[in-house]
Every structure is written in C-alpha cells, then in structure tokens.
C-alpha cells in the first residue's frame, strides 16, 4: 500500500520505533482489558 504523506515528515522516521512500541503496548493493554471483561461475563 502507498505510504501516507506524513511518512515524509522527519518526525515519522525518528519516532517510528517508539510509536510502534507504544501502539503495541496499547493493543496489549486493550487485549488484557478485553480478557478481564470476558472473565467477568
């Protein structure tokens, strides 16, 4: 797929790794919350 224009911003390059890590952390937390919710249900 075509890269979005924002990928040309230097910031995108310098923060790519940390933003990916933050997103993965967010997803993991979301999955954990979902699991807890399922347990309650």
């Amino acid at each position: 797929s075509e890269e979005p224009p924002i990928s040309l911003d230097l910031t995108f390059h310098l923060l790519r790794e940390v933003l990916e890590m933050a997103r993965a952390e967010q997803l993991a937390q979301q999955a954990h919350s979902n699991r807890k919710l399922m347990e309650i249900i």
Epitope: P5, I6, L8, D9, F12, H13
Partner: antibody, heavy 118, light 112 residues
Framework: QVQLVQSGAEVKKPGASVKVSCKAS????????MKWVRQAPGQRLEWMGV????????FYNQKFKGRVTITRDTSASTAYMELSSLRSEDTAVYYC???????????WGQGTLVTVSS | DVVMTQSPLSLPVTLGQPASISCRSG???????????LEWYQQRPGQSPRLLIY???NRFSGVPDRFSGSGSGTDFTLKISRVEAEDLGVYYC?????????FGGGTKVEIK
C-alpha cells in the same frame, strides 16, 4: 504559507488545568506531526510531546507524562495541549511547532504565555 | 537525557565582525541511521524561535549564507561570518537523535 496560530495568554491558579490551541493553515494538517515546546523564564526550551494528526498517535516526553494531554481536531486543523495540576514552575510560553522532511521544528506558533499564580 | 551544553552564555559582538558559538552533547548524537540530527535555532527578542541549520551544516530555506554550522559526534559550532543588527538574540542548539529531544541552554548574542 505555513501558519500556526495559537490561543491567547492565560492566568491560572495552582492545581488548575490549561488548554492551549494551535490552528494550522497553509498546508494539509494531517501531513505533518505537531509538537509542543515550552520556554519557562530563564530556562532552556523543553520538548513536551508530539502528535500524529493523521492517526492520532501521541508520544510524550517522560518528564510531562501523566500531566500533559495532546489532542487534535482534524476537521478544524487544530492541535491542543492540556497541562493539568499546574504549579508556579509551569509559568512559561508554550509553543506548537511543525517540522519538514529535513528538520523537526521548521515552523513555530507565536507562543502562548501561561502564568500560574495564586 | 542527552545534555546539550552551549558556550559562551553571552557573546558580546561588534557588528560586521565574526562570531562563533559552541555546543557540546553529553554523548554522541549520531543516530542509528548514521545521520546527526543537530539543529540550530535563533530567537530574536519577543519572537518565536526560527530554524537556521539542520543536520549539523544545512541552511534552512531563507537563511542568509553568513550562517554556517559544522561539527561531528559531540562537538558542534555555529558561525556567523559578519554579524548584522538583525542577528542579535539567543541561539539554541538542539538534538533530535535521541529521545527525549533536548535543547541547549542558549547563547545570547549582544552588541559589545
């Protein structure tokens, strides 16, 4: 031309919160990250955080994590920075800034003075 | 955090004469991609900062050629070949190679 126009000066009491806005024009708002930097009297410039207006990803300087919230409204081409639990040391000029493909802070807002005083 | 140390704190200059500002980083600011994200900013009294130099030695668009940047690793310099009245203000170095991004403490260029 690229323009970043910030909201006006604010005076706040310790413990309160402040929300500063930054309206972008002259370019496609979602094509560039927006950063926030502050300058307290007699202190060096401090980078506070950054938002990807396209996807909403945010990354904060650990120093401010928990107290600062950066958001955006793409329909209004505006970024916001909210700082909570204000103390006197937060008295500063707050800037929004945008980079390019070559540099991190190529264009700056005019700055917003936030004064925290009881 | 990478500490950026500038010297001198204050630089009295004579208009038309050269000026030089030093910036040292507490550790190497060569990024893992082999680039050095060292930038210089000028802040005139009462104004917002303005980008002068990016990646150590590249002038940003509209910046006069009397400004030049050099250095590598941990040691960087901003030179003004002939200081003009409009150059008076505070100059900051900045590193974007390591998070958190950090600025130097500033050097005030003033009339002697």
């Amino acid at each position: 031309q690229v323009q970043l126009v910030q909201s006006g000066a604010e005076v706040k009491k310790p413990g309160a919160s402040v929300k500063v806005s930054c309206k972008a024009s002259g370019y496609t708002f979602t094509d560039y990250f927006m950063k926030w930097v502050r300058q307290a009297p007699g202190q060096r410039l401090e980078w506070m955080g950054v938002i990807n207006p396209n996807q909403g990803d945010i990354f904060y300087n650990q120093k401010f994590k928990g107290r600062v919230t950066i958001t955006r409204d793409t329909s209004a081409s505006t970024a916001y920075m909210e700082l909570s639990s204000l103390r006197s040391e937060d008295t500063a000029v707050y800037y929004c800034a945008r980079g390019t493909d070559r540099a991190l802070f190529a264009y700056w807002g005019q700055g917003t003075l936030v004064t925290v005083s009881s | 955090d990478v500490v950026m140390t500038q010297s001198p704190l204050s630089l009295p200059v004579t208009l038309g004469q050269p000026a030089s500002i030093s910036c040292r980083s507490g550790q190497s600011i060569v990024h893992s991609d082999a680039n050095t994200y060292l930038e210089w900013y000028q802040q005139r009294p009462g104004q917002s900062p303005r980008l002068l130099i990016y990646k150590v030695s590249n002038r940003f668009s509209g910046v006069p050629d009397r400004f030049s940047g050099s250095g590598s690793g941990t040691d960087f310099t901003l030179k003004i070949s002939r200081v003009e009245a409009e150059d008076l203000g505070v100059y900051y170095c900045f590193q974007g190679s390591h998070i958190p991004w950090t600025f130097g403490g500033g050097t005030k260029v003033e009339i002697k």
